[in-house]
Each structure stands twice: as structure tokens, then as C-alpha cells.
């Protein structure tokens, strides 16, 4: 008995005088504007994106928009076309969606917040956008109290216009239209497609926040990974830095590249190699590899427990007014619009800790 | 360039044993999971057995469980499939496999014949 | 176990036919499926994995598509070197299972 290092858990409520605001991650669930996608663009992506079959031909479709179609043909007309060099990162940071035009309006603690205020940061959905990243030298942002007013409130436009059109099942095309949101501690980056929630247009969202601060053991008394981090790639360790950290090698080793949200220096995958290599093992690794990418617990970790509400936006009260405001049509405001509020809902942390059962 | 290369096989009386093995290269061993798929005279393809790449977990078809043992070395980089109380029935080709999003490559194929 | 039943399990063709080799999982196994090509006393050939992804270096005349239960392999256009024995596979859960094979002859 003496030998079983049995530990018990501590749970506490600790009030606090201010609050570290987390990091918030966003990301358009459409990955590139299609206005953005130039003649080059199609030529080397587009059968990645089910635009186009592998003879460079726009597929025979009877689901095409009739203004995307005429645009997409005109863009697919190969005739004495020279392609040009391509990048996916490049493809990516240009054609993603601009937090400038997203965000029609950003308020944090009741300031006025602008686009200035998120960082880029790249993801498996392409180009997203941090606020509060704590990084490039800017101070972590505190609350002083509880409740919607003291945390960050924004409004945005998912530009559904701007979506891709669907005419095949691809991992880089989707079928929903909003945001995919991630809270978490600037201490670890953002695995927004595993760890985010969505959030619809037409809604206001609110997420009430509770931080929670977990101690673990390390052996024999827990599990918990007690050294820093073995990585080229990440200063702290965290189960998410751990994660991107394998599944950059996974890919490296079976495609011999990196997706573009990966860290490292591993030469950006091809179009060409993303649809025939590095989707499908990532697609392997994520759901069906229990064992490659197995990281261990650290042994301080800060997570944020939510609570998630929402009302209608706009209600009929306010279409006329927004769809003034912003110069668009009822409907674009219905269909595209939407608000999100993050804030805690009481100034305390909560503390669950491992604890030695004895000495 | 990856290779899977299968050894072992040949004739064997019914209840006899054999060991198959079967040496990669080309890749990290100890990081993908491995199966062993059989294939009898003039029939289709069976999947036999199922490690991963640790060698912790183990995974066998019904037809086979409790008289085959699949493990793997990863110090030499080597699966193998320890076949005992072998039946007529399991007269075959036996192929190695790489697990993963894509099953390759597979070992050339090895001929086990159990008769007397 | 998950079941994969092959249809047909023999099919005549000629050469440019088009044609189709279905195959149906007992439950779902999203898109982890392959299709292989094997010919008298060969390995099998990956055709196409993860359902729709052609394997580099196999014609494109070969496609595969479905998610779930149900998937085709088709060959747009036969050639004599088609002439073989395909099997699906699906990787989704062990135990892995295979169809039971369907013979392309010549007509």
C-alpha cells in the first residue's frame, strides 16, 4: 500500500482582483475569397478545390451559380495561358478572408477595438486571426469584472458572397457558413479545428467564461509531463503545441512537406500533394491513429470553461436600421451578420489540484 | 525508396508452426502500424492480423486468434507472424502491409503450404 | 465485424467500355476505403484510397467516390491491361475487411 503514490484533488473557488482576458482565435469556415482566386490560382488549385476535374475543365455542373459559373469559365480558359509560380501560403495569406472587411465593428471593456488588434496566425482553415495573442511585444489585456460589458464584443460580416462554390467534397471547402472560434491561453497556440465552436450568422452569441487553473501530479503520483518542451517549434509545452508539433512530423515523414499552418521549414505542400497526400494522412492521423501523436498532460494548464447562448440578429425591429448602416441588402444582413461576446462570468478562477494524498 | 521485404514461409505439416518476418526500410518503422493480409489458392484477399507501432496493441481475425502471435522489432525494423497450430486451411500467400492513410507498400508475397 | 459485399463478382466488358464495381459496408466507414487491382500470382495494386484519391501513377481513366456505405470504382475506358481481379478494402476499424473480389474479363 505504501508503494501506490495515491493522490486526491483539490477544488477551489479564488476570487481575484483582475482577470488575464484570454486569447480569441477566429476563423471564416470558407478558406479563400472567390473573388481572390486569380486565373493562376485555378490553374494550380483548382481541382483541389473541386473547381476544376484533373483536365484542367470547369465539371460538368448543374449546381453552379450562373454569375460564379461565367466568372469561373472565363478564369478557366487555358488557352495560350502561362502558369506562374505558386504558393500555397501565399495563396492563403492573399485570398483568405481580411479581418479589415470582416469586422464591422470590435469594442473590448467598452474601447473601441479594430482590426489592428488581431493577429494573423494560420491554421487548418487557413488564414485566421488572434485577438489578445499577447505576442509581437503587446501586453496581455485584463478584465476587471464579470459580465458582457467587460469583455469583448464584435461584429462581423462572414461575406457568404465571397464562398467558394461547393461542387465536390474536399477538406479545404465547406458546407457551412460562419466562424469557428477557439478561447485559450496565450501560453498555447490556437487547434482551432479540433478544440474550436462554431458560430452562426444571424445569431448573437454570448460565451460566458469561467477560468479554470488544473495542477497535475507528475509520476508516480500522476501523469502529468513535468519538463519543457522538446521542440524546435514552441517555447512552452502544451497538449496543443505537442500535437502540431507531431502532426508537422507525420506529414513531413509520409508527404515530405508541411501544410501551411505548420511550423518548421519543411518546403509548403503542393496542391498537388495536399489532395493526394497530405489531407488524406492528416485525415488518417486525426481519426484513425491513436497511438503516433500521444501527448501527455502538462503539468499546469490553464482552460476556459463556457457557457454559450444566443438571440436573433437582426431582429425585424433592426433589419432596416443594419441593412442601412452597413449598406447592404435585409437579407445580406440576415445571411451574413453576426455578433459575438466573450466575457467571464465572475471575476474568480477556479483551481483543481492534484494533490500528494501523503508525504 | 519504402520496401517491405517478407521471409519465412514454405511447407509445414497440419499443427506445425512457422514464423513469417518481414524487414522494412525506406521509412520510420516504429511509427506506423503493420498488418499481415493472406491470400488462399484462387480466393480473395483476408486481412490476418494488426499491430501498431509501438507493438502495445495487437488485432486478430476470428479465423486465426489464439494460434497466430503478430509482433514487431523496432530496433531492427522487423514484423513478424508466429503461426502455430497450423490447419490446412491456412495454406496461402501471406503479405505484410503498411498502415496507413494508404496501404503501401505491400511485401512481395509469401507462399505458406500446410499439408502432410 | 464489418461486412463488404463486392458486386458484380464476375463482369464482362469490352475494351473502351465504361464500367462500375460497386462495393457496400455493413455500417459506416466514412471514407476510409481502397480499391485494389491484383492480377494472377501479383501483389495487389493500390488503385485508389481514401475513396476518391488516385494513387500517383495510375491512370486516370480509374475513379473512385462514395462516403459511408456505399462506393464505386469505375473505369472510364477499358484497356486490355485492365483485365484483372479488383477488391475493395475498408481501413476504417479493425478487423479490416476486404470484399470478396470481382473478375473483369474480356467479352
Known amino acids: 500500500y505504501y508503494f501506490c503514490y495515491h493522490h486526491v484533488t483539490k477544488l477551489d473557488e479564488v476570487a481575484a482582483s483582475q482577470l488575464t482576458f484570454p486569447a480569441v482565435t477566429l476563423c471564416n469556415l470558407n478558406e479563400f475569397r472567390f473573388s481572390q482566386v486569380s486565373k493562376n490560382d485555378l490553374y494550380h488549385a483548382g481541382e483541389l478545390l473541386a473547381l476544376l476535374n484533373n483536365r484542367y475543365e470547369i465539371p460538368d455542373t448543374q449546381m453552379a451559380d450562373e454569375k460564379q459559373l461565367e466568372i469561373l469559365q472565363d478564369k478557366a480558359n487555358f488557352r495560350s495561358f502561362k502558369p506562374k509560380p505558386f504558393n500555397m501560403r501565399e495563396f492563403y495569406d492573399r485570398a483568405g478572408h481580411d479581418i479589415r472587411d470582416m469586422l464591422l465593428s470590435c469594442h473590448f471593456r467598452g474601447e473601441a477595438c479594430s482590426a489592428e488588434d488581431f493577429k494573423v496566425v494560420f491554421t487548418r482553415y487557413g488564414k485566421c486571426y488572434t485577438f489578445n495573442s499577447g505576442q509581437d511585444g503587446r501586453p496581455r489585456l485584463k478584465t476587471m469584472k464579470g459580465g458582457t460589458g467587460n469583455g469583448l464584443e464584435i461584429m462581423l460580416d462572414i461575406q457568404q458572397d465571397e464562398y467558394l462554390p461547393v461542387w465536390g467534397e474536399t477538406d479545404e471547402t465547406s458546407f457551412e457558413a460562419g466562424i469557428k472560434v477557439q478561447i485559450h491561453s496565450q501560453d498555447e497556440p490556437p487547434f482551432i479545428d479540433q478544440l474550436g465552436f462554431g458560430v452562426a450568422p444571424g445569431f448573437q452569441t454570448f460565451v460566458s467564461c469561467q477560468e479554470q487553473r488544473l495542477i497535475y501530479l507528475p509520476s508516480p503520483w500522476g501523469t502529468c509531463n513535468a519538463v519543457t518542451m522538446d521542440s524546435d517549434f514552441f517555447d512552452s509545452y502544451s497538449i496543443t503545441a505537442c500535437r502540431i508539433d507531431c502532426e508537422t512530423r507525420y506529414l513531413v515523414e509520409n508527404c515530405n512537406c508541411r501544410m501551411v499552418h505548420m511550423p518548421g521549414d519543411a518546403p509548403y505542400c503542393t496542391p498537388e500533394q495536399y489532395k493526394e497526400c497530405a489531407d488524406p494522412a492528416l485525415d488518417f492521423l486525426v481519426e484513425k491513429d491513436q497511438e503516433y501523436c500521444v501527448c501527455e498532460m502538462p503539468c499546469n494548464l490553464t482552460r476556459y470553461g463556457k457557457e454559450l447562448s444566443m438571440v436573433k440578429i437582426p431582429s425585424k425591429a433592426s433589419a432596416k436600421y443594419l441593412a442601412k448602416k452597413f449598406n447592404k441588402s435585409e437579407q445580406y444582413i440576415g445571411e451574413n451578420i453576426l455578433v459575438l461576446d466573450i466575457f467571464f462570468e465572475v471575476l474568480n478562477y477556479e483551481t483543481i489540484e492534484q494533490k500528494k494524498a501523503y508525504e | 525508396e519504402v520496401q517491405l521485404l517478407a521471409s519465412g514461409g514454405g511447407l509445414v505439416q497440419p499443427g506445425g508452426s512457422l514464423r513469417l518476418s518481414c524487414a522494412a526500410s525506406?521509412?520510420?518503422?516504429?511509427?506506423?502500424?503493420m498488418s499481415w493480409v493472406r491470400q488462399a489458392p484462387g480466393k480473395g484477399l483476408e486481412w490476418v492480423s494488426g499491430i501498431s507501432g509501438s507493438g502495445g496493441s495487437t488485432y486478430y481475425a476470428d479465423s486465426v486468434k489464439g494460434r497466430f502471435t503478430i509482433s514487431r522489432d523496432n530496433s531492427k525494423n522487423t514484423l513478424y507472424l508466429q503461426m502455430n497450430s497450423l490447419r490446412a486451411e491456412d495454406t496461402a500467400a501471406y503479405y505484410c502491409?503498411?498502415?496507413?492513410?494508404?496501404?503501401?507498400?505491400w511485401g512481395q508475397g509469401i507462399r505458406v503450404t500446410v499439408s502432410s | 465485424d464489418i461486412q463488404m459485399t463486392q458486386s458484380p463478382s464476375t463482369l464482362s466488358a469490352s475494351v473502351g467500355d465504361r464500367v462500375s464495381i460497386t462495393c457496400r459496408a455493413s455500417q459506416s466507414i466514412s471514407s476510409w476505403l481502397a480499391w485494389y487491382q491484383q492480377k494472377p500470382g501479383k501483389a495487389p495494386k493500390l488503385l485508389i484510397y481514401?475513396?476518391?484519391n488516385l494513387d500517383s501513377g495510375v491512370p486516370s481513366r480509374f475513379s473512385g467516390s462514395g462516403s459511408g456505405t456505399d462506393f464505386t470504382l469505375t473505369i472510364s475506358s477499358l484497356q486490355p491491361d485492365d483485365f484483372a481481379t479488383y477488391y475493395c478494402?475498408?481501413?476504417?476499424?479493425?478487423?479490416?475487411?476486404f470484399g470478396q473480389g470481382t473478375k473483369l474479363e474480356i467479352k
Open positions: 478494402q475498408q481501413y476504417n476499424s479493425y478487423s479490416y475487411t
Open positions: 502491409a503498411k498502415e496507413a492513410y494508404k496501404w503501401q507498400p
Open positions: 525506406g521509412f520510420t518503422f516504429s511509427s506506423f502500424a
Open positions: 481514401k475513396a476518391s
